[in-house]
């Protein structure tokens, strides 16, 4: 909400699935920036008022995080500088399924991409030779 004259940057997500009770990954990459302090990562979810996760100025900023995700999210802080904004989601729940948005701001501009996340009790198929 608000106005910015910066250019858009490319943000890429991959649809994924998470196993209930286990940890999951929501994948997101972006055009990297040379300064970590200039990078802002925000994860949002449709149907949720607060943020899923926010990372800015080189650290997590959790004051705007929705209580539904409290204590369950993390980014790979050491990989942000190379353009990895993927989110680790701990203890995946059925209600975590839905549409997420990975929103990125850097000194080059801003961009976002949606991701469909499915949850369930998945198992690896057995292959008999």
């Amino acid at each position: 909400f608000g106005i910015s004259g910066r250019h858009s940057i490319t943000v890429t997500t991959v649809a994924s699935a998470g196993n209930i009770g286990e940890d999951g990954i929501l994948s997101c990459t972006f055009e990297p920036d040379i300064k970590l302090s200039d990078i802002v990562i925000q994860w949002l979810k449709e149907g949720v008022l607060g943020l899923v996760h926010e990372f800015k100025e080189g650290k997590d900023e959790l004051s705007e995080q929705d209580e539904m995700f409290r204590g369950r999210t993390a980014v790979f802080a050491d990989q942000v500088i190379v353009g990895n904004a993927s989110l680790r989601l701990k203890n995946v729940q059925l209600t975590d399924a839905g549409t997420y948005k990975c929103y990125i701001i850097t000194s080059k501009g801003k961009g976002n991409a949606n991701l469909e996340y499915k949850t369930g009790a998945f198992s690896m198929p057995e292959v008999n030779v």
């Epitope: 909400f1 008022l49 004051s63 705007e64």
Partner: antibody
Framework: QVQLVQSGAEVKKPGSSVKVSCKAS????????INWVRQAPGQGLEWMGG????????RYAQKFQGRVTITADESTSTAYMELSSLRSEDTAVYYC????????WGQGTLVTVSS | DIVMTQSPDSLAVSLGERATINCKSS????????????LAWYQQKPGQPPKLLIY???TRESGVPDRFSGSGSGTDFTLTISSLQAEDVAVYYC?????????FGQGTRLEIK
């Protein structure tokens, strides 16, 4: 610097509706919730509800459920709060505020409900 | 809903003296995993919107004078103004942002004695 500018004062009749707008400018984020907080004359602050402008997700306080509708238009960076079935007790200053932590506030809109 | 109760309702303090406002929540707003209290303090002057002073119970918002400090944990919190200035005359509110609905205390009116 983020600025929230609200629409002007309104005088309404009991039973009618009012729609207050809140236009955001100067910020780079379109991701924080826009909340609505009201303050009756000489009274405290009361959270009415909020919206995530990017997805249009709205949440309301139980007290206002069914009477309030919060919407947002991303293209104009404007949030709206509509309150229906107005009664005299709804006379108050209505504020929009950005974020769960209300770091930025609109200037307030006085809504007077009187017959 | 979490109920926030402030005390006193009003307070008169001499210029240069210490002012203390208390806030109690009906349930804990401390999240033990990150050891953070989801408690904020706001200042509201007549005819103006509230202004955020303190969040995480004790972190001053940028630009807020260091005479303002916050303390407490769990359910009991305090806002302290170490040396009251004339411009500090206002109503002060605590707010919990631990859970939705966000709730505020009823406010404490601070005046000069």
């Amino acid at each position: 610097q983020v600025q929230l500018v609200q629409s002007g004062a309104e005088v309404k009749k009991p039973g009618s509706s009012v729609k207050v707008s809140c236009k955001a400018s100067g910020g780079t984020f379109s991701t924080y919730a826009i909340n609505w907080v009201r303050q009756a004359p000489g009274q405290g602050l009361e959270w009415m509800g909020g919206i995530n402008p990017m997805f249009g997700t709205a949440r309301y306080a139980q007290k206002f459920q069914g009477r309030v509708t919060i919407t947002a238009d991303e293209s104009t960076s404007t949030a709206y709060m509509e309150l229906s079935s107005l009664r005299s007790e709804d006379t108050a200053v209505y504020y929009c505020a950005r974020g769960r932590l209300h770091r930025h506030w609109g200037q307030g809109t006085l809504v007077t409900v009187s017959s | 809903d979490i109920v926030m109760t402030q005390s006193p309702d009003s307070l008169a303090v001499s210029l240069g003296e210490r002012a203390t406002i208390n806030c109690k929540s009906s349930q804990s707003v401390l999240y033990s995993s990150n050891n953070k209290n989801y408690l904020a303090w706001y200042q509201q002057k007549p005819g103006q919107p509230p202004k955020l002073l303190i969040y995480w119970a004790s972190t001053r918002e940028s630009g807020v004078p260091d005479r303002f400090s916050g303390s407490g944990s769990g359910t009991d919190f305090t806002l302290t103004i170490s040396s009251l200035q004339a411009e500090d005359v206002a109503v002060y509110y605590c707010q919990q942002y631990y859970t939705t609905p966000i709730t505020f205390g009823q406010g404490t009116r601070l005046e000069i004695k």
